[in-house]
């Protein structure tokens, strides 16, 4: 039987409360051997895939998704999943991105990702590896910044 894949984690740098117009980077982490990380938003069909996966530690890989200039439209819950042939992982917990006016008060503390969001059904998939659908070279800002689409 195939080994279960550990759930990914998600975090945000420099934090989850971001001033309007500033940048944020989502960091997805999983085990070594991940081929594709995917960043998703709740209740949406749009996503951003990357195969630019680096080794964060001897037992962990990561991918980074940067939004250069956040708008109100970027606020909301984000999560990661990953593909380690031949299986997809479960989804990470949701991480809520808050966008604040630049004239606002002091920064809120960073939100750390939770450890578990409960079990998710796993695929019974023994398929061969396939190339992921083409990402068309789009940046996360284009995918998630649609209120000020370039």
């Amino acid at each position: 039987q195939e080994e279960d894949l550990p759930r990914p984690s998600i975090s945000a740098e420099p934090g989850t409360v971001i001033p309007l117009g500033s940048h944020v980077t989502f960091v997805c982490r999983g085990p070594v051997g991940v081929q594709t990380f995917r960043l998703e938003r709740e209740s949406r069909s749009t996503y951003n895939d990357t195969e630019d996966v680096s080794q964060a530690s001897p037992s962990e890989s990561e991918a980074r998704f940067r939004i250069d200039s956040v708008s109100e439209g970027n606020a909301g819950p984000y999560r990661c999943i990953y593909y380690k042939p031949p299986k997809w992982s479960e989804q990470s917990d949701y991480l809520e991105l808050l966008v604040k006016e630049t004239s606002g008060g002091p920064d809120s503390p960073d939100t750390e990702p939770g450890s578990s969001a409960g079990p998710t059904q796993r695929p019974s998939d023994n398929s061969h590896n396939e190339h992921a659908p083409a990402s068309q070279g789009l940046k996360a800002e284009h995918l998630y910044h649609h209120h000020h689409h370039h």
């Epitope: 995917r38 996503y47 895939d49 992982s89 998710t120 695929p123 998939d125 659908p133």
Partner: antibody
């Protein structure tokens, strides 16, 4: 690459029917696999999709009565409490091009479901 | 909930002419809109995605534009083979939707 729906036919009101979409040339777990239906002479109606770790989304009207599941090569649509309004052609369509699971670039020919007593 | 309104319901133009179909979203969807062509007895065919990107193998006579809530499909230099029903589809939201497709526009080529 292609997909083919099967399992359609004539069924009585109140019954349950499961349609199957069989993929060839690609692996369904790497894509968003959608079900779309079309009543005779009417427009397209999205039912829902499944992807990744069997994550599903459904149209509001389909929740509870329709269930999508999958294996590595097939995607099933289970329909319960069928009525005459469920009569139509049911399509299986692959999504994922252009970074959206709702961009449907590969469609099966469809299978006809008729609900009648 | 997000609703797509397609106009007109039907349009008739001569060979060589131009057809413009509009799709209005009840809330902003950025550029997450696709267009499909469907001929009788056939499944739909993806023409355009992300509002203006041409799908593989689709003629450049088809063009898409718009963002936010207003979108347009333009078919230029009409051919008899373009006679079909055209549907827009929002490609962003999968939660709290009744349908992702617009109502369709029948194109008749005279």
């Amino acid at each position: 690459e292609q997909s083919l729906e099967s399992g359609g036919g004539l069924i009585t009101p109140g019954g349950t029917l499961t349609l199957t979409c069989t993929a060839s040339g690609f692996t369904v777990t790497r894509y968003y696999m959608n079900w779309v239906r079309q009543a005779p002479g009417k427009g397209l109606e999205w039912i829902g999709y499944i992807y990744a770790s069997s994550k599903t989304y459904y149209a509001n009207w389909a929740k509870g009565r329709f269930t999508i599941s999958k294996t590595s090569t097939t995607v099933d649509l289970k329909m319960t409490s069928l009525t005459a309004e469920d009569t139509g052609t049911y399509f299986c369509a692959r999504g994922g091009v252009g970074n959206s699971g709702l961009n449907l670039d590969l469609w099966g020919p469809g299978t006809l479901v008729t609900i009648s007593s | 909930e997000l609703v797509l309104t397609q106009t007109p319901a039907s349009v008739s133009e001569p060979v060589g002419g131009t057809v413009t179909i509009k799709c209005q979203a009840s809330q902003s969807i950025g550029s997450w809109l696709a267009w499909y062509q469907q001929k009788p007895g056939q499944p739909p065919k993806l023409l355009i995605y992300q509002a203006s990107r041409l799908a593989s193998g689709v003629s450049s006579r088809f063009g898409g534009s718009g963002s936010g809530t207003e979108f347009t499909l333009t078919i230029s230099d009409l051919e008899c083979a373009d006679a079909a029903t055209y549907y827009c589809q929002q490609a962003e939201y999968s939660g709290d939707v009744e349908n992702t497709f617009g109502g369709g526009t029948e194109v008749v080529v005279k």
